[in-house]
C-alpha cells in the first residue's frame, strides 16, 4: 500500500550531490525519504562517491541490458 512521490520543494535537501528526493507514502507508517543518486554517487543520501572502476562497470552492464 506504499507508493513513491516526488519530494516537496522544501524537502529536496534531504539528498545531496544532485540526488532526486522521493517520499515513501505509507498510510500505516510515518513518511520516509529515499534518494535516487546522480551517476557517481551512492548511499542513503547520495553522500558517497562511487569509484570510477565501479561506475564504468555499471555503464557496461547498463549497455549490455539494453
Amino acid at each position: 500500500t506504499s507508493h513513491l512521490v516526488k519530494c516537496a520543494e522544501k524537502e529536496k535537501t534531504f539528498c545531496v550531490n544532485g540526488g532526486e528526493c522521493f517520499m515513501v507514502k505509507d498510510l500505516s507508517n510515518p513518511s520516509r525519504y529515499l534518494c535516487k543518486c546522480q551517476p557517481g554517487f551512492t548511499g542513503a543520501r547520495c553522500t558517497e562517491n562511487v569509484p570510477m572502476k565501479v561506475q564504468n562497470q555499471e555503464k557496461a552492464e547498463e549497455l549490455y541490458q539494453k
Epitope: E11, K12, T13, F14, V16, N17, A44, R45, T47, E48
Partner: antibody
Framework: EVQLVESGGGLVQPGGSLRLSCAAS????????IHWVRQAPGKGLEWVAA????????NYADSVKGRFTISADTSKNTAYLQMNSLRAEDTAVYYC?????????WGQGTLVTVSS | DIQMTQSPSSLSASVGDRVTITCRAS??????VAWYQQKPGKAPKLLIY???FLYSGVPSRFSGSGSGTDFTLTISSLQPEDFATYYC?????????FGQGTKVEIK
C-alpha cells in the same frame, strides 16, 4: 524532546588524541544524519564530518581526513568523533547536529584545546 | 569545494529596521541553502532551510529567498533579541560549507 549532548572535550598536547561523544535522545537515531561542526575561538563555523547511521556512510572535511574518524553506535544512540594527531588549529568548540533538511538540532558544544 | 561569501561581514542597525544579509555561492547550489543565528557562547539555531522555508518556531519576521548562486536573509523589523551573528550554509554537495558570518550589532 530532541536532545544532543556532547562530551569528551578537554586540553590535549599536539599530536595527542581525544574521543568526543554525542549522546542523542528524543528521535529515531538510526534514521537521521549526524554531523560534527566546529568553531575556533572568535571564528566562524566549519563543517568537519558526517555519518549516516542507517548505512554507515561517512564524509570528512579535507582538513581532518585521515586524522579524524566518525562513527555511531545505534544501540547507544551515540555518535563519536575520534580525533588523532591533533594540531593547534584543531582548537575549537565542537558541536554535533542532526540533519533532516538542514542542521535542525544542535548540542551545546564541547571545547577542545590543543596546546603544549 | 563550494565557497559561500556573505556580505556584509558586520552591520549596525536599530530596533525596527529592515535588515538584509546576502550570500553568494561560488557555483549553482539550487535551493540547498540554510540560514542560522548564533549568539555568543551558544550553539547555532536554524532559521531558514531550502533557501526560503521558515523553520518551526522561528518568528515570521525572518524570511529567505534565492536560488542558484544568490541568496538573501531578511529580517523585516529587527527586534532586540535578533542582535547576533548569522551564517548561511550550502548542503548541495559534500563538503558542506558555511559563509564567514554577518554580525548584526546595535547602532
Amino acid at each position: 524532546e530532541v536532545q544532543l549532548v556532547e562530551s569528551g572535550g578537554g586540553l590535549v598536547q599536539p599530536g595527542g588524541s581525544l574521543r568526543l561523544s554525542c549522546a542523542a535522545s528524543g528521535f529515531t537515531f538510526s534514521g537521521t544524519w549526524i554531523h560534527w561542526v566546529r568553531q575556533a575561538p572568535g571564528k566562524g563555523l566549519e563543517w568537519v564530518a558526517a555519518i549516516t547511521p542507517a548505512d554507515g556512510s561517512t564524509n570528512y572535511a579535507d582538513s581532518v581526513k585521515g586524522r579524524f574518524t566518525i562513527s555511531a553506535d545505534t544501540s547507544k544512540n551515540t555518535a563519536y568523533l575520534q580525533m588523532n594527531s591533533l594540531r593547534a588549529e584543531d582548537t575549537a568548540v565542537y558541536y554535533c547536529a542532526t540533519y533532516m533538511f538542514a542542521m535542525d538540532y544542535w548540542g551545546q558544544g564541547t571545547l577542545v584545546t590543543v596546546s603544549s | 569545494d563550494i565557497q559561500m561569501t556573505q556580505s556584509p561581514s558586520s552591520l549596525s542597525a536599530s530596533v525596527g529596521d529592515r535588515v538584509t544579509i546576502t550570500c553568494r555561492a561560488s557555483q549553482d547550489v539550487s535551493t540547498a541553502v540554510a540560514w542560522y543565528q548564533q549568539k555568543p557562547g551558544k550553539a547555532p539555531k536554524l532559521l531558514i532551510y531550502s533557501a526560503s522555508f521558515l523553520y518551526s518556531g522561528v518568528p515570521s519576521r525572518f524570511s529567505g529567498s534565492g536560488s542558484g548562486t544568490d541568496f538573501t536573509l531578511t529580517i523585516s523589523s529587527l527586534q532586540p533579541e535578533d542582535f547576533a551573528t548569522y551564517y548561511c550554509q550550502q548542503s548541495y554537495t559534500i563538503p558542506m560549507t558555511f559563509g564567514q558570518g554577518t554580525k548584526v550589532e546595535i547602532k
